[in-house]
């Protein structure tokens, strides 16, 4: 799997999980989240060469098509596969509120 | 939706569905499929600017991150959203066999 265990251990130009820390205030302009101040969002990036972690029949076909037609621009792309939620604390006035924001953290990637 | 109805009607540099006809023999080197000779596989391509059809909370956050941090390389990518199967006819010896290949045709795209 193109997850932290594999990607953060290997120098990999191909599609892989990349570390990215987002500071809510500095990077998003969000002052409304009290805790955490930021989080490890991560992101997916890298080349998708022939059959590198292709996740669908279509991406495998496209991968093969590109190998046979190298001038083609129709190549698969490195995107998130597994995502996890992030629990945040914010205030509605003086009242603290805990909320789980879905699909905030990328755990693994795929070529799609 | 970034589907044929929208994308094939508009000239769109941003992430959109693109037409792609794949000839099994010529483009994939597959001689084993008897019918059809090829099919409209389509593919997704184009830029994913600020919040263009972002499909998850993470891709929206990443989009906002990129706007505030334009030097960042952590941008969403244009990939397939809805896929459909393709029914094919092939032969096992002299015996015709009909098979449905899943996720062969891209119907719409998203920034992920």
């Amino acid at each position: 799997a193109l997850d932290a265990a594999y990607c953060f251990r290997n120098v990999q130009d191909n599609c892989c999980l990349r570390p990215l820390y987002i500071d809510f205030k500095r990077d998003l302009g969000w002052k409304w989240i009290h805790e955490p101040k930021g989080y490890n969002a991560n992101f997916c990036a890298g080349a998708c060469p022939y059959l590198w972690s292709s996740d669908t029949q279509h991406s495998r076909v496209l991968s093969l098509y590109n190998t046979i037609n190298p001038e083609a621009s129709a190549s698969p792309c490195c995107v998130s596969q597994d995502l996890e939620p992030l629990t945040i604390l914010y205030y509605i006035g003086k009242t603290p509120k805990i909320e789980q924001l879905s699909n905030m953290i990328v755990k693994s990637c795929k070529c799609s | 939706a970034l589907d044929a109805a929208y994308c094939f009607r508009n000239v769109q540099d941003n992430c959109c569905l693109r037409p792609l006809y794949i000839d099994f023999k010529r483009d994939l080197g597959w001689k084993w499929i008897h019918e059809p000779k090829g099919y409209n596989a389509n593919f997704c391509a184009g830029a994913c600017p600020y919040l263009w059809s972002s499909d998850t909370q993470h891709s929206r956050v990443l989009s906002l991150y990129n706007t505030i941090n334009p030097e960042a390389s952590a941008s969403p990518c244009c990939v397939s959203q809805d896929l459909e199967p393709l029914t094919i006819l092939y032969y096992i010896g002299k015996t015709p066999k009909i098979e449905q290949l899943s996720n062969m045709i891209v119907k719409s795209c998203k920034c992920s």
Partner: antibody, heavy 120, light 108 residues
């Protein structure tokens, strides 16, 4: 320069529907919580609803809950207020406003307002 | 809901004079959950004071806010003709946000 421009106000019959639009410019739209506030003719200000961009957390005043829907198109820098089952007491000038940063906060920029008249 | 009560309902002052208006909350807001707005005739509200005493950018220092708990005051010194407006207090300590009914300021 920060600008908020509302539109969509009209004369509508009781029970009717209307959609108000607020287009923002001059700042990173998705960084600030957005509110709708209304003002009946000759009266004071009444808060209607808020939405947190990107995460789409919304909250409503009891008087409009179940009838009004606040939404946002982050990519178009646009805030909406879908108003259904309108009542005569919904007659007001509707303002969109942005907060200083917190969910409930002072509102540092306001639109010019759009007038909604509910009358038979 | 927190009820905000403003007094007086209206007041008149002479140019150059100092005027004060009050805002009382039905329960304690703490020290920083109150804002003041100015609304000139036919215009949208404009933020004057937030956090009970912090002036919004571009607001003249003739405007000042004070108070904590349930009692807050807006003071306008060196009154000008352009200060004719309705003034509203707003609490944001608790949901829903609520506003006072307003104080109408006129120039003698």
């Amino acid at each position: 320069d920060v600008q908020l421009v509302e539109s969509g106000g009209d004369l509508v019959k009781p029970g009717g529907s209307l959609r108000l639009t607020c287009v923002a410019s001059g700042y990173t739209f998705s960084s600030n919580v957005m509110h709708w506030v209304r003002q009946a003719p000759g009266k004071g200000l009444q808060w209607v609803a808020y939405v947190i961009p990107i995460v789409d957390i919304a909250y409503y005043a009891d008087s409009v809950k179940g009838r009004f829907t606040i939404s946002i198109d982050n990519s178009k820098n646009t805030l909406y207020l879908q108003m259904n089952s309108l009542k005569t007491e919904d007659t007001a000038t509707y303002y969109c406003a942005r907060t200083l940063g917190l969910v409930l906060d002072a509102m540092d920029y306001w639109g010019q307002g759009t007038l909604v008249t509910v009358s038979s | 809901d927190i009820v905000m009560t403003q007094s007086p309902g209206s007041l008149a002052g002479s140019p150059g004079q100092q005027v004060t208006m009050n805002c009382r909350a039905s329960q304690s807001l703490g020290s920083s959950y109150l804002a003041w707005y100015q609304q000139k005739p036919g215009q949208h509200p404009e933020l004057l004071i937030y956090g009970a005493s912090s002036r919004a950018p571009g607001v003249p220092d003739r405007f000042s806010g004070s108070g904590s708990g349930t009692d807050f005051t807006l003071t306008i010194s060196n009154l000008q003709a352009e200060d004719v407006a309705n003034y509203y207090c707003q609490q944001y300590a608790d949901s829903p946000i609520t506003f006072g009914q307003g104080t109408k300021l006129e120039i003698k």
